[in-house]
């Protein structure tokens, strides 16, 4: 039903949902404080356009009763019932940030009336795909199905001369929420990855994965997973790996493989480490500095939710136009505005656009190098190590079938 | 990244024996491997044992079957076993970890063997 927005004369609030169930443990209190400090940046950008208005946020908690579970699980309601919680307070913002979780975003967004935007730090899956006053914050599970597609397809680079058309992809079941979208996204036999690849199984048990690593029988020598080095190590532990096996970690989320003083430990040597560029300044930044690697990226979400709202207040207001209409709403994508660490690409779908790297661990100095970098904006790739040092024979990536020639 | 102690060197006549101990601040079970390095006078320090959190072993040529290397998880200590020791054996010993991101280095311990 049609909620008033608290969105108008001067006074702009945003509604922030504080749920129980997110796609990240991240204490409720970091998240804000993300929201605080991209308030106070909001603010102060609107004052320096000469904009004398108020822009605050409203924290809304479910009573954590009922939906409990603290992952994704139980999500699917909470969020219902704190949209009901803010339909009966009259107390909807101009635009609400919150649903990190594909099913209750998903919900919502079909249960609702949306005449208001959606900022979502979160929302992995290909359902949230394509919605129109839905914004994504952190990269979605279609952004990594056509770097996959892309990568595979490649067959210039020096270190890859073979097209590839299989795959493994291990998925056990106990991943991480942005994990098990991206891996479900690769599983779904209508999704653009499947679509594209010739053969392709999903291994659900460690054994599979485990007997894969040495059969000679194995239909493919590519292998996806999702998480990180620990996550690997202790699925394959010290088993031998055949030398044509590669093994693609994707593990977006995660900073550390850019810190310094990080080394690849031995097992890492058949490995691709799919990640995202971390910040100009993130690594060091005083918003950061209590946040662990693989929530930064979280926080972060929220915080740049907080300067899109704020992107987008001042373009309206500037021109004059209203806060409460379609407009508004659809309005959340198709740009480019200036994020906590630089500018942050929105695509028609208000997807954001990142640009994906990928790591190989250099036999010589066990450190991890960049291979290649992929802008999702323009879905194409850019070779950065032209002579890596591979453990694979003749620092190449061998072909995906073993005994194929090339093609 | 993780703080690891020695103890346990000193002086030793050949074909004694001696245990050498590390301790490290943090549950060795969420390390990748532990490692036993040695450095002698004017030489390259060198790997003389490993242990991975997986179990696995492995020992320099130099030492087989004289050495071994163990764990206590309940301690978080690694032990090295040194057993028919010879001059050779000479060096300080370092013990080393890796976190599954990060190298740690103990300070070392002196192990003198001489009659």
């Known amino acids: 039903s049609q909620v008033s927005q608290n969105c108008h004369n001067g006074s702009y609030e945003i509604s922030v949902l504080m749920m129980g169930n997110s796609a990240f443990a991240e204490p409720l209190k970091n998240l804000e404080d993300a929201v605080n400090e991209g308030l106070e940046i909001v603010r102060g950008r609107l004052q320096n356009a000469g904009l004398n208005v108020t822009v605050n946020a409203t924290f809304m908690y479910s009573d954590g009763l009922i939906h409990n579970s603290g992952d994704c699980r139980s999500s699917t309601c909470e969020g219902l019932d704190l949209l009901r919680k803010i339909s009966n307070a009259q107390r909807m913002g101009c635009v609400l940030i919150g649903p990190s979780c594909t099913y209750s975003t998903f919900q919502m967004y079909l249960d609702t009336e949306l005449s208001y935007p959606m900022i979502s730090a979160g929302s992995f899956g290909l359902s949230c795909d394509y919605k129109e006053t839905l914004t994504r914050l952190m990269s979605p599970a279609r952004k990594l199905m056509y770097f996959l597609v892309n990568f595979w397809k490649t067959n210039d680079l020096p270190f890859k001369t073979y097209s590839w058309s299989t795959s493994y992809v291990y998925k056990n079941g106990t991943e991480t929420e942005d994990c098990f979208w991206y891996l479900n996204a690769l599983e779904a036999s209508v999704s653009y990855f499947s679509h594209e690849l010739g053969f392709k199984v999903v291994l659900r048990q460690d054994k599979e994965f485990q007997d894969i690593l040495m059969d000679h029988n194995r239909k493919s020598n590519v292998i996806i997973m999702c998480g990180g080095p620990e996550f690997l190590y202790k699925l394959k532990g010290d088993r031998a790996v055949a030398e044509d096996i590669v093994i693609i970690l994707v593990d977006l989320f995660n900073d550390q493989y850019f810190e310094d003083n990080v080394t690849a430990p031995d097992y890492m040597k058949n490995v691709l480490v799919l990640t995202l560029s971390p910040g100009n300044s993130l690594l060091n930044s005083s918003f950061s500095r209590n946040l662990s690697p693989t929530k930064r990226d979280f926080a972060l979400a929220y915080l740049n939710g907080i300067l899109l709202f704020g992107h987008m207040l001042k373009i309206f207001l500037e021109n004059g136009e209203n806060i409460t209409t379609p407009k508004f709403a659809h309005a959340f994508r198709n740009l480019t505005f200036e994020g906590y660490d630089g500018p942050v690409t929105l695509d028609d779908w208000g997807d954001v656009d990142s640009t994906m790297v990928l790591l190989y661990t250099s036999v010589d100095t066990k450190k991890y190098k960049v291979l290649l970098t992929y802008d999702t904006h323009v879905n194409k790739t850019y070779p950065v190590d032209m002579s890596p040092t591979f453990t694979w024979k003749n620092s190449k990536l061998p072909n995906d079938i073993t005994g194929r020639g090339p093609q | 990244q993780v703080q690891l102690v020695e103890s346990g060197g000193g002086w030793v006549h050949p074909g004694g024996s001696l245990r050498l101990s590390c301790a490290a601040s943090?549950?060795?079970?969420?390390?990748?491997?532990v490692d036993w390095y040695r450095q002698a006078p004017g030489k390259q320090r060198e790997l003389v044992a490993g242990?991975?959190?997986?179990?696995?072993?492995s020992y320099a040529d130099a030492v087989k079957g004289r050495f071994t290397i163990s764990t206590d998880n309940v301690k978080d200590t690694v032990y090295l076993q040194m057993n028919s020791v010879t001059p050779e054996d000479t060096a300080v010993y370092y013990c080393?970890?890796?976190?599954?991101?990060?190298?740690?280095w103990g300070q070392g311990t002196q192990v003198t063997v001489s009659s």
């Open positions: 943090r549950n060795i079970f969420s390390m990748y491997r």
């Open positions: 242990i991975t959190s997986g179990g696995t072993t």
């Open positions: 080393h970890a890796h976190d599954h991101w990060r190298d740690s």
